[in-house]
């Protein structure tokens, strides 16, 4: 398991891998993630993780998925995962190619959460919900 | 049928400025696409310069252009130009008019599935 | 930036025969990576995406392959047409926020 203790210096750190990440991020495989309880648009989510030096998570290991539902609180949060509509596919905001399921697909849901179900949701861009930024652990 | 012409190429003197305009058709700028400018000196490879998202107008350079070069698009008139200024024998290439597919708001894309013939201009006093 | 470095620069091959061309990249690109290829005096066309999938209207003779850094284009059964040069191009984004594409060097496929 591991094992995470405060450091004086807005770090939380693991010891077993000897990895940083900043006061309220969650360390996973080398990666930390910031789930927001503030809520805000698909646009305006992106440039909240981009300020924070990360960009909003790319969920592609089952994993991954797993460690972040776990955490979710039962909320839905947007992750960067975009619908490339005239390619007709979804795309993590890194440009590779997402080969999973997205549900509740619909014409004007351009952008993706995860958090309220056990799947990947389709969703409005312009509706207000958490968010989830990632970027590699120190 | 969807397609890209270039024009505006030509001879121009070193220190010159050049815009070329690429003319899409059968498909609309208001749809989710990147387009780019891509440049090819004469027996080199493919070099990346320039895009803008067709529906936003958010604009990409290569970290080389250094402001020599700005891209632009009207909606209206389906084209995308590439203003080129402070021209070099180096800028000797021709200029292809590139289309990517986009994700939702400009923030992804892909591969060039849609090309120009391309435009000569070469540099030289 | 992520490098494309693309091998060999130029290849012979006969009719009927297969050629390989490789393209790594200088970090993974998580197979976002696309083949071209160009004849003499024209536009370059796109062959395969997503690093395996072909292109509507290829002929299922062009295959692509690999993950991580390290990519291949196989031409199985070359014909005279076949005869151009061949470009990867990386399209992955590792910071999101630029478009960044970056291509190979080329390779130039002789047929004999």
């Known amino acids: 398991p591991q094992i995470f203790n405060k450091s004086n210096d807005g770090f939380t750190t693991t010891r077993s891998y000897g990895t940083v990440c900043p006061k309220d991020w969650e360390f996973y495989q080398a990666r930390c993630f910031f789930l927001s309880t503030s809520e805000s648009s698909w646009n305006e989510s992106r440039d909240f993780c981009k300020g924070k030096g990360s960009t909003l998570a790319i969920v592609n290991t089952p994993e991954k998925l797993k460690f972040l539902q776990d955490i979710t609180d039962a909320e839905k949060y947007f992750i960067g995962l975009i619908y490339h509509r005239e390619e007709k596919r979804w795309r993590w905001i890194n440009n590779s190619v997402f080969n999973g399921n997205v549900t509740n697909q619909n014409q004007n849901f351009n952008c993706a959460t995860i958090g309220l179900t056990k799947t990947f949701d389709a969703a409005s861009c312009d509706i207000s919900y958490r968010r989830i930024c990632e970027k590699n652990a120190k | 049928q969807q397609q890209l012409e270039e024009s505006g190429g030509g001879l121009v003197k070193p220190g010159g400025t050049l815009t070329l305009t690429c003319t899409a058709s059968g498909f609309s700028f208001s749809s989710s696409y990147y387009m780019c400018w891509v440049r090819q000196a004469p027996g080199k490879g493919l070099e990346l310069i320039a895009c803008i998202y067709s529906s936003s107008g958010r604009t990409w350079y290569a970290t080389w252009v250094n402001g020599r070069f700005t891209i632009s698009r009207s909606t209206s008139l389906n084209t995308v130009d590439l203003k080129m200024t402070s021209l070099t024998a180096a800028d000797t290439a021709t200029y292809f008019c590139?289309?990517?597919?986009?994700?939702?708001?400009?923030?992804?894309?892909?591969?060039?599935?849609?090309w120009g013939p391309g435009t000569l201009v070469t540099v030289s006093s | 930036d992520i490098v494309m470095t693309q091998t060999p620069a130029s290849v012979e091959a006969g009719v009927g025969g297969t050629v390989t061309i490789k393209c790594q990249a200088s970090?993974?690109?998580?197979?976002?990576l696309a083949w071209y290829q160009q004849k003499a005096g024209q536009r370059p066309k796109l062959l395969i995406y997503?690093?395996?999938t072909l292109a509507s209207g290829v002929p299922s003779r062009f295959k692509g392959s690999g993950s991580g850094t390290e990519y291949t284009l196989t031409i199985s059964g070359v014909q005279p047409d076949d005869a151009a040069t061949y470009y990867c191009q990386n399209y992955y984004d590792s910071t999101g926020s630029g478009y960044g594409a970056a291509f190979g060097g080329g390779t130039e496929v002789v047929v004999k």
């Open positions: 997503d690093a395996s």
């Open positions: 590139a289309r990517s597919y986009a994700g939702y708001g400009g923030y992804g894309y892909a591969y060039f599935n849609l």
């Open positions: 970090e993974d690109i998580y197979s976002s």
